[in-house]
Interface confidence: low
């Protein structure tokens, strides 16, 4: 693209099925030109997205794109839910689409929870 605007390449309706107890890296692909933006992760709770300030994050730089990574070490059952990354630069702020984690408890690793089960467990 000719535009030098920041882009957040999280696919709409993307999802990850992961196991509790495993390490996991949730990536926010970030495209920028000159100055790297300030990026944060938040977790959706109803209509609000709660900023994850006390979680380990890191940057991974690649040739054409960078990744702002939220680390889960290890994944916990209550990590179930939807996450969003946001970028702040100059006076602008953009938000990614949400990405959903479906966490399967190791006790029942053979069964992936349904979306309804996951939702009721998450919002309970």
């Amino acid at each position: 693209k000719e535009s030098c605007d920041v882009q957040l390449y999280i696919k709409r309706q993307s999802e990850h099925s992961i196991l509790a107890g495993d390490p996991f890296e949730l990536e926010c692909p970030v495209k920028y030109c000159a100055n790297r933006p300030h990026v944060t992760w938040c977790k959706l709770n109803g209509t609000t997205c709660v900023k994850l300030e006390d979680r380990q994050t890191s940057w991974k730089e690649e040739k054409n794109i960078s990744f702002f990574i939220l680390h889960f070490e290890p994944v916990l059952p209550n990590d179930n839910g939807s996450y969003r990354c946001s970028a702040n630069f100059q006076s602008n702020r953009i938000e990614s689409h949400s990405t959903t984690l479906y966490v399967t408890d190791v006790k029942s690793a053979s069964e992936r929870p349904s979306k309804d089960e996951m939702a009721s467990r998450f919002w309970a």
Partner: antibody, heavy 118, light 111 residues
Framework: EVQLQESGPSLVKPSQTLSLTCSVT????????WNWIRKFPGNKLEYMGY???????YFNPSLKSRISITRNTSKNQYYLQLNSVTTEDTATYYC????????????WGHGTTLTVSS | DIVLTQSPASLAVSLGQRATISCRAS??????????MHWYQQKAGQPPKLLIY???NLESGIPARFSGSGSRTDFTLTINPVEADDVATYYC?????????FGGGTKLEIK
């Protein structure tokens, strides 16, 4: 709900400048991308360009010497200006929003029909 | 520019049957491992309406009779079963590369 509405003249003389307005409700033009597309009488669709949430612009190279896209964030409007129009610019002009990821056009205006004729 | 060639230019399908529209790109559509190819429906006197985004994702509110498939240079829109309300012109669009381009359109009629 996001709504876009084009406004402007329906008839312009050759060599004059076309000015169109797209008024946006239900979303801020300081988010996403805001595009202009036109459809010619033969049904061909042509992408003209965009103004982004930050105010940066992109123009189709086929129009680059004649086109400008600007905005007024306080009015939540963006504008198309096309200079030196000819009869070849006769078309229906649409404004549309596209998303950060994928750039597909999820909301469109109803379109405004322009005839270039002396 | 990426040229999108749609075929057929028009087709007539019986109610309840399947309609298949093809879109072939002059270059690979594969930005960041994703196919930025989209499909729109345009009825007479109306603006285009998004049906499928990123090759195979159904836009919210669009009936599941519509589906998209394909990758790289060959993409397909399928309507199954066709209903009377589907009479329209269908366009593919790529947003993989500037300038964005549209296919020439496929006019769907009922037999």
């Amino acid at each position: 709900e996001v709504q876009l509405q084009e406004s402007g003249p329906s008839l312009v003389k050759p060599s004059q400048t076309l000015s169109l307005t797209c008024s946006v409700t239900g979303d801020s033009i300081t988010s996403a991308y805001w595009n202009w597309i036109r459809k010619f009488p033969g049904n061909k669709l042509e992408y003209m360009g965009y103004i982004s949430y930050s105010g940066s612009t992109y123009f189709n190279p086929s129009l680059k010497s004649r086109i400008s896209i600007t905005r007024n964030t306080s009015k939540n409007q963006y504008y198309l200006q096309l200079n030196s129009v000819t009869t070849e610019d006769t078309a229906t002009y649409y404004c549309a929003r596209s998303h950060y990821y994928g750039y597909y056009f999820d909301y469109w205006g109803h379109g405004t029909t322009l005839t270039v004729s002396s | 520019d990426i040229v999108l060639t749609q075929s057929p230019a028009s087709l007539a399908v019986s109610l309840g049957q399947r309609a298949t529209i093809s879109c072939r790109a002059s270059e690979t559509i594969d930005s960041y491992g994703d196919s930025l190819m989209h499909w729109y429906q345009q009825k007479a006197g109306q603006p285009p309406k998004l049906l499928i985004y990123r090759a195979s994702n159904l836009e919210s509110g669009i009936p599941a009779r519509f589906s998209g498939s394909g990758s790289r240079t060959d993409f397909t829109l399928t309507i199954n079963p066709v209903e009377a309300d589907d009479v329209a012109t269908y366009y593919c669009q790529q947003t993989d590369e500037d300038p964005y381009t549209f296919g020439g359109g496929t006019k769907l009629e009922i037999k």
